[in-house]
Interface confidence: low
């Protein structure tokens, strides 16, 4: 028996295509590129029907439906714009991912353009089906310092000019150290900030001496020391990592990393600092910030900063030789021979940064570590040298500039 003539579906074809079909003849229905066979609400690549003994087809011809890539995946710290009218997500439609500028930028300067493929997947020429990555922009504060030739004896920092500074605070709100934001979920600070004072009789660092992640919190976007700030973000701590070669007696490798429980929202008041690209030049001017003690042993109301020069390593070693204190290669010194400008108690772990004038970007040089009293003549502030431990920092955090 002969079966009725078949019409191929719109955007599809029938194979084999012949004038007449008889009992037991089979037909394969397929669709054009970018379309799928739709039968009983089920999508498939092909559909087969057969001419039956009674001269009818075993099934109705299915329809061809355009492939739909559906809503594209959300991009963390990014936005999606549709290039097609009516926000179409069907075959050959185009979308563009972009990052939340100016606080995030796309890794490898990817175009961010994705096209809906015939397979129903959003595809990028370089990344394939993988989403792009929005990386935090580092060291580019929205508010720049009013340039002054020098800062004498420290001065209050202008709000928003040090957006990478972190306050390490006890849960009752009492600050105890500083730190710097790296990437979107790490704080670099001093290792000595993360443990109790050791017993001078037995100065061995034990696990029980370490602060637990739940003993303190991180506050970003902070300006005032104790007063609340509408820009501040309070973040829990997931994990702490002290440098494996940290020596609490000599302060060698006095650096630690704090992983945040959640990522802060980057904005004009919260932005990471860049890791150093190379070694620091002696004589270069650096800025040190913190909420630590000032002269007269008073704590300031707001964030303070000082501008001081990097000091030659051998000069610093000689200054501390009479005190039998070692200034090792993982340390960097800064300050002025006459004294008067220095970090002090409570500044520990806080940032020492320098401006790369060509790029207009700020880089982390060191973290406040130790010294002989504060601001003493012929004594310099000693900082943990970030360049020396950059590989370790990058290995633990995965942060790249």
């Amino acid at each position: 028996n002969e079966c009725p003539e078949l019409q191929p579906p719109v955007h599809g074809k029938i194979e084999p295509s012949q004038a007449k079909y008889f009992f037991k003849d089979q037909v394969l229905v397929s669709c054009d590129t970018g379309y799928k066979v739709l039968k009983d609400n089920v999508e498939m690549d092909t559909f087969q029907i057969e001419c039956l003994k009674d001269g009818t087809w075993s099934n109705k011809i299915p329809t061809c439906k355009i492939v739909d890539c559906r809503a594209p995946g959300e991009l963390e710290h990014g936005l999606i714009t549709f290039s097609t009218r009516n926000n179409l997500t069907t075959y050959k439609s185009e979308i563009k991912y972009s990052c939340q500028e100016p606080y995030y930028k796309m890794l490898n300067n990817n175009t961010g353009i994705y096209t809906c493929s015939a397979q129903g997947v959003w595809m990028n020429k370089v990344l394939g089906r993988s989403l792009p990555t929005c990386l935090p922009v580092c060291g580019l504060p929205k508010f720049s310092r009013k340039l002054m030739a020098r800062i004498f004896n420290g001065r209050p920092a202008q709000k928003g000019t040090t957006p990478w500074i972190a306050m390490l605070s006890h849960l009752n709100g009492q600050p105890f150290c500083g730190g710097s934001l790296l990437g979107s979920s790490w704080i670099v600070t001093a290792a000595h900030c993360l443990h109790q004072s050791l017993d001078p009789e037995d100065p061995t660092l034990r696990d029980s001496d370490l602060l637990s992640p739940s003993d303190f919190k991180i506050i970003l976007g902070k300006h005032w020391r104790l007063r609340s700030d509408e820009n501040e973000q309070h973040l829990g701590v997931k994990h702490t990592t002290l440098h494996p070669q940290y020596d609490p007696n000599t302060f060698e490798n006095d650096v630690a990393l704090v992983e945040l429980l959640e990522s802060p929202v980057l904005n004009a008041f919260v932005m990471p600092i860049c890791l150093p690209e190379g070694p620091q030049q002696e004589g270069a001017m650096v800025i040190v910030s913190g909420w630590g003690k000032q002269f007269l042993q008073r704590f300031p109301e707001t964030l303070m900063e000082i501008e001081i020069p990097i000091v030659d390593h051998s000069t610093c070693q000689k200054a501390y030789a009479p005190l039998k204190k070692k200034v090792t290669r993982d340390m960097i010194c800064a300050g002025e021979k006459e004294g008067g400008k220095d970090a002090c108690a409570g500044d520990s772990g806080g940032p020492m940064v320098t401006l790369n004038r060509e790029r207009g970007q700020w880089y982390l040089v060191g973290t406040v570590s130790w010294g002989d009293d504060c601001g003493k003549k012929d004594r310099y502030g000693v900082y943990s040298y970030i360049h020396h431990n950059k590989d370790w920092i990058q290995r633990v955090t995965g942060v790249r500039n």
Epitope: L171, N172, L211, S212, S214, Q233, H234, G236, K238, L261
Partner: antibody
């Protein structure tokens, strides 16, 4: 160990103070939580105090009716405006790790003290 | 406050079988969750903290997993002694506040 005391039968509106007594550890090094359990029901968190600093936090449903405070070796839970809904066994519990609030769970629980609010 | 939604409310298992209890937090609480066991007329006992760390003295057949908003307690090779009600708890710190909310509990019966 920790042990609660002070639970009894009271009429609605009567204030009541429960006491949590610690022994074998320095209460100042730990956060002490109060948790309650109505008959046949689940556990309900009330709040906590970190004794060294005196910092307290409460569940939002407490709405100022309960206050947690401390002495040198005890932590008190002062309860006001009691209703029949507050009938429960009240537990105090210590966090596993010392040094402030620790997200290490409550490792040391008292046997509980029963508070019955009835007219 | 954070809401901890625990499922199922009750479960029955044969000795040697596996029990899985889930807890969903209403917001990301990182690894700040704990699990407790409570037998009738007894005080609760800490089983798991930090989402996956086994508390001291807890048999290794108990395990915890998850982070963010989804947490799971698994009892592999269930014993008669495991019949109890199990509770999840948030131990979350954020923005100067602490949350210790418990889930509604799961009653485990052994067949």
């Amino acid at each position: 160990s920790v042990e609660e005391s002070g639970g009894r039968l009271v009429t609605p509106g009567t204030p009541l103070t429960l006491t949590c007594t610690a022994s074998g550890f320095d209460i100042n090094n730990y956060a002490i939580h109060w948790v309650r359990q109505a008959p046949g029901e689940g556990l309900e968190w009330i709040g906590y105090i970190y004794a060294r600093s005196g910092v307290t936090w409460y569940a939002s449903w407490v709405k100022g009716r309960f206050t947690i405070s401390k002495t040198s070796t005890t932590v008190d839970l002062k309860m006001t405006s009691l209703t029949t809904e507050d009938t429960a066994t009240y537990f105090c519990a210590r966090v596993l790790a010392g040094g402030g609030y620790a997200n290490t769970g409550l490792s040391l629980w008292g046997p509980g003290t029963l508070v019955t609010v009835s007219s | 406050d954070i809401v901890m939604t625990q499922t199922p409310s009750s479960v029955s298992a044969a000795v040697g079988g596996t029990v899985t209890i889930k807890c969903q937090a209403s917001q990301n609480i990182g690894y700040s969750s704990a699990w407790y066991q409570q037998k009738p007329g007894q005080r609760p006992k800490l089983m798991i903290y930090g989402a996956s760390t086994l508390a001291s003295g807890v048999p290794s057949r108990f395990s915890g997993s998850g982070s963010g908003t989804e947490y799971t307690l698994t009892i592999s090779g269930v014993q008669c002694d495991d019949a109890a009600t199990y509770y999840c708890q948030s131990n979350y710190i954020s923005s100067g506040s602490v949350d210790g909310t418990f889930g509604g509990g799961t009653k485990v019966e052994i067949k």
